[in-house]
C-alpha cells in the first residue's frame, strides 16, 4: 500500500541534494585553505540532522546549531556586504573585491545557495516531491529557518561600516519582508556597527533619478536610525562601470560618478 505523503505548495528538495552539499563542501574547503580542517561528511551529517525525520513545518534554529558550530568561520566584521534582490551583482562584486564578503561567500551560505530541502516527520526520507512554501504553508520550514539563522548570525557579527546592495529597479527598493528587511536590519548591533551604507543599483542606462530619496529608502533610514545606527546612501548609476572600476580603480574614467 503506497504511504500517504504530505503535498506541499513549494518545489521539492533539489535533486541530488546530498551529493550537491557534499561536493560544494569539498570544493569550498579546497579553495579556502583556512577551512581545510572541516570534515565535510560531518558537515553533511549535521545538515541532514537538522531536518531529517522532523516535521518540515516545525523546524527551529536550535535544529541547525550543530551545523552552525561546524561551519564556524572567520569573516572580517568590517568587510560585510549584505544584499537584497540583487544577489548576482553582489556576488560579482565580492569576486572582484576579494576582501569583502556576502553570506554566500561563507561556507554555510555557499552550501545552501539556491537549494531547497525538506524531510518528513518520522521517516529518514528526503522529500523530493514538494516542500513547504513560506507563504502558503508555513514559515518554520527547513529552508526559511536555515536562512533566518545564518542571516541573523551574519548581521550580528557585522561591525564598523556595513554595506548593503539594493535593487533600484524594483518597485520596493527596500522590502521589509525580504531577509535583509526582516532579519538582518534588526540584528545589526549598535555597540558594533557605526553606519549602514546602502548602495542603490540603477537598472536603466538613462536613469539619473536620486533613488536614495525613494520612500522605501527613507523607511530603511528610519528603521536604522531607530536602532541608533547611522545611515548613508549612494546611487550606483552604472553597475557595469561600477564593477569595471572595482577591477581597475586607476582607470581615468573612474574618478567620475558611477
Amino acid at each position: 500500500v503506497p504511504r500517504w505523503r504530505q503535498q506541499w505548495s513549494g518545489p521539492g528538495t533539489t535533486k541530488r541534494f546530498p551529493e550537491t552539499v557534499l561536493a560544494r563542501c569539498v570544493k569550498y574547503t579546497e579553495i579556502h585553505p583556512e577551512m581545510r580542517h572541516v570534515d565535510c561528511q560531518s558537515v553533511w551529517d549535521a545538515f541532514k540532522g537538522a531536518f531529517i525525520s522532523k516535521h518540515p513545518c516545525n523546524i527551529t534554529e536550535e535544529d541547525y546549531q550543530p551545523l552552525m558550530k561546524l561551519g564556524t568561520q572567520t569573516v572580517p566584521c568590517n568587510k560585510i556586504l549584505l544584499w537584497s534582490r540583487i544577489k548576482d551583482l553582489a556576488h560579482q562584486f565580492t569576486q572582484v573585491q576579494r576582501d569583502m564578503f556576502t553570506l554566500e561567500d561563507t561556507l554555510l551560505g555557499y552550501l545552501a545557495d539556491d537549494l531547497t530541502w525538506c524531510g518528513e516527520f518520522n521517516t529518514s526520507k528526503i522529500n523530493y516531491q514538494s516542500c513547504p512554501d513560506w507563504r502558503k504553508d508555513c514559515s518554520n520550514n527547513p529552508v526559511s529557518v536555515f536562512w533566518k539563522t545564518v542571516s541573523r548570525r551574519f548581521a550580528e557579527a557585522a561591525c564598523d561600516v556595513v554595506h548593503v546592495m539594493l535593487n533600484g529597479s524594483r518597485s520596493k527598493i527596500f522590502d521589509k519582508n525580504s531577509t535583509f528587511g526582516s532579519v538582518e536590519v534588526h540584528n545589526l548591533q549598535p555597540e558594533k556597527v557605526q553606519t549602514l551604507e546602502a548602495w542603490v543599483i540603477h537598472g536603466g542606462r538613462e536613469d539619473s533619478r536620486d533613488l536614495c530619496q525613494d520612500p522605501t529608502i527613507k523607511e530603511l533610514e528610519s528603521i536604522i536610525s531607530k536602532r541608533n545606527i547611522q545611515f548613508s546612501c549612494k546611487n550606483i548609476y552604472r553597475p557595469d562601470k561600477f564593477l569595471q572600476c572595482v577591477k581597475n580603480p586607476e582607470d581615468s574614467s573612474c574618478t567620475s560618478e558611477i
Epitope: T106, F154, P190, E191, Q194, S225, N228, I229
Partner: antibody, heavy 114, light 111 residues
Amino acid sequence: QIQLVQSGPELKKPGETVKISCKASGYTFTNYGMNWVKQAPGKGLKWMGWINTYTAEPTYADDFKGRFAFSLEASASTAYLQINNLKNEDMATYFCARKYGGYWGQGTTLTVSS
Amino acid sequence: DIVLTQSPPSLAVSLGQRATISCRASESVDSYGNSFIHWYQQKPGQSPKLLIYRASNLESGIPARFSGSGSRTDFTLTINPVEADDVATYYCQQVNEDPLTFGAGTKLELK
C-alpha cells in the same frame, strides 16, 4: 572633538532622588546610543544599561530595574540618569559612555550619607 | 550573562619588563572569528580609556607598547616594555552580547 561632560558631584541622603546629566558634543547625539556604567568605591565597572538616543527607549540590566531611569533631552544633546529612593549601596561614580567608539564621560561621584 | 575572569588581580612589574594580563570568558565572545573584547586602562579618579578594541586592534593614539591577542574565550593584554605611566587598573569588556560585562580588573604596580 567628541566630548561627554557630566554634572558635578552629588551628596544625598538615603531615600532622596538624584539626577545626573551627560552632555555630548562633537557628534550627532541621536546617531549613537548611550551606556551608563557604575563603579562603587574601590570596585570594578558594572554596566547598568543603555538608552536609545533616537527613540528614547531605555534598556536596563537586571540589577538596575526599578529605581533607575534613563532619559534624554535630545535637543540639548543630553542624557540623564535618575536614581530614586537612594540607598547606601548606590554610593559610587557613575559614567556615561557612548555606544561604539570608546568615548566616556569624566564620571559623577554620588555620596549617599545620612 | 558572560562572565569575564581576569588574572592576576594585581601585578608588580619592573620598569622595562613585560606585563601580561589574562581575561577568560565563560563562553565564546567571537562572531565569525571576530572577538568582541575591548581593553581599558583606568587611573585613579579618571574615566576608563580604550586601549585595544576587538581583541587586537590598537586604538588611535595608544603607544605600540600595548598589544592584545586571543580568540573565543581566552584573551591577553601585553604591555612591553612597561613604563611608569602605565601604573593603573586594566579591565577587559565584552560587547558581543547584552548585558555588556567587564572583568574585575587587574591592578598594575611597579616593582
